[in-house]
């Protein structure tokens, strides 16, 4: 994570800052939401455990044409050590439930804020 740069500030970014920036972006999405986020698109629910960042990206990357989450997708790619492309589900171990993108973002935000408060930045 110390090499995360490019989505907010130049050069290396401390892990705590990278996580903060992702949280801020998700907060902005939830607070600025007027119409249904991404036209109510559905994505696979994920287990918020190890490999969560890659799983989140694999789920969200299948939503196309939604500018509101493009920055989130870019940020998540900085947290995921491997390249993720649409239709790839290597980190999504369980694919049994689909939820709206708005709910996905809320769930992810709550979990990331808990990790931040606990000091778990990696």
């Amino acid at each position: 994570l110390t090499c995360l740069g490019g989505f907010a500030s130049p050069g290396p970014v401390p892990p705590s800052t990278a996580l903060r920036e992702l949280i801020e972006e998700l907060v902005n999405i939830t607070q600025n939401q007027k119409a249904p986020l991404c036209n109510g698109s559905m994505v696979w629910s994920i287990n918020l455990t190890a490999g969560m960042y890659c799983a989140a990206l694999e789920s969200l990357i299948n939503v196309s044409g939604c500018s509101a989450i493009e920055k989130t997708q870019r940020m998540l790619s900085g947290f995921c050590p491997h390249k993720v492309s649409a239709g790839q589900f290597s980190s999504l171990h369980v694919r049994d439930t689909k939820i709206e993108v708005a709910q996905f973002v809320k769930d992810l935000l709550l979990h990331l804020k808990k990790l931040f408060r606990e000091g778990q930045f990696n």
């Epitope: 800052t17 903060r20 949280i23 907060v27 804020k113 808990k114 931040f116 408060r117 606990e118």
Partner: antibody
């Protein structure tokens, strides 16, 4: 109206354990995003953050004092308790509790404070 | 730990004056800077959070600015009730740290 009040001994002896209680009203520590912090200010010195506890029992401590501090909450009594072991004269200070809220961004801003309680460490 | 340096440590100004207090962080804290006011014999009050957001009930003569490492608290027109000590605090990284305070008096 949000209020917080600190209570505890005025005088403690060196090596003893200090127990401070923060009793609050106007909010609940069972409500999402709520937290309570402890801060102190020795005479003539800067404010120093000690610890905080969140509604979901996540606890964080100042690393410089972590081995001596324990923070806990009793939601039903609307109280947060801080214990500090092995007290020393340099721990003489006014101790404050304050509320913090993490809705939206996590600002770590303390929006309501107690009046403070002065603790003197002396034999 | 992030060191917070406030200046001046004290100042004296006339009613109606524009007063500026600065706070410098030893490293980048982005916009996570909060300002507090402690009046003699009163509880500490949050004035401004996240650099420039006014806490509820705070008069509009108070404002904050800055980013990164350098921040400013401004009182646009000093009032007698503004006599107090003002503290900055960084909320970016634990442990949370405070500036040494600025005591504001009326000439």
């Amino acid at each position: 109206e949000v209020t917080l009040k600190e209570s505890g001994p005025v005088l403690v002896k060196p090596t003893e354990t200090l127990t401070l209680t923060c009793t609050f009203s106007g909010f609940s520590l069972s409500t999402s995003d709520m937290g309570v912090d402890w801060i102190r200010q020795p005479p003539g010195k800067a404010l120093e953050w000690l610890a905080h506890i969140w509604w979901d029992d996540v606890k964080r401590y100042n690393p410089a004092l972590k081995s001596r501090l324990t923070i806990s909450k009793d939601t039903s009594k609307s109280q947060v308790v801080l214990t500090m072991t092995n007290m020393d004269p340099v721990d003489t200070a006014t101790y404050y509790c304050a509320r913090t809220v993490s809705s939206g961004y996590i600002y770590y801003a303390m929006d309501y404070w107690g009046q403070g309680t002065t603790v003197t460490v002396s034999s | 730990d992030i060191q917070m340096t406030q200046s001046p440590s004290s100042l004296s100004a006339s009613v109606g004056d524009r007063v500026t207090i600065t706070c410098r962080a030893s490293q980048d804290i982005r916009n996570y800077l909060n300002w507090y006011q402690r009046k003699p014999g009163k509880v500490v009050k949050l004035l401004i959070y996240y650099t420039s957001k006014l806490h509820s009930g705070v008069p509009s003569r108070f404002s904050g600015s800055g980013s990164g490492t350098d921040f400013t608290l401004t009182i646009s027109s000093l009032q007698p009730e503004d006599v107090a000590t003002y503290y900055c605090q960084q909320g970016n990284t634990l442990p949370l740290t405070f500036g040494g305070g600025t005591k504001v008096e009326i000439k």
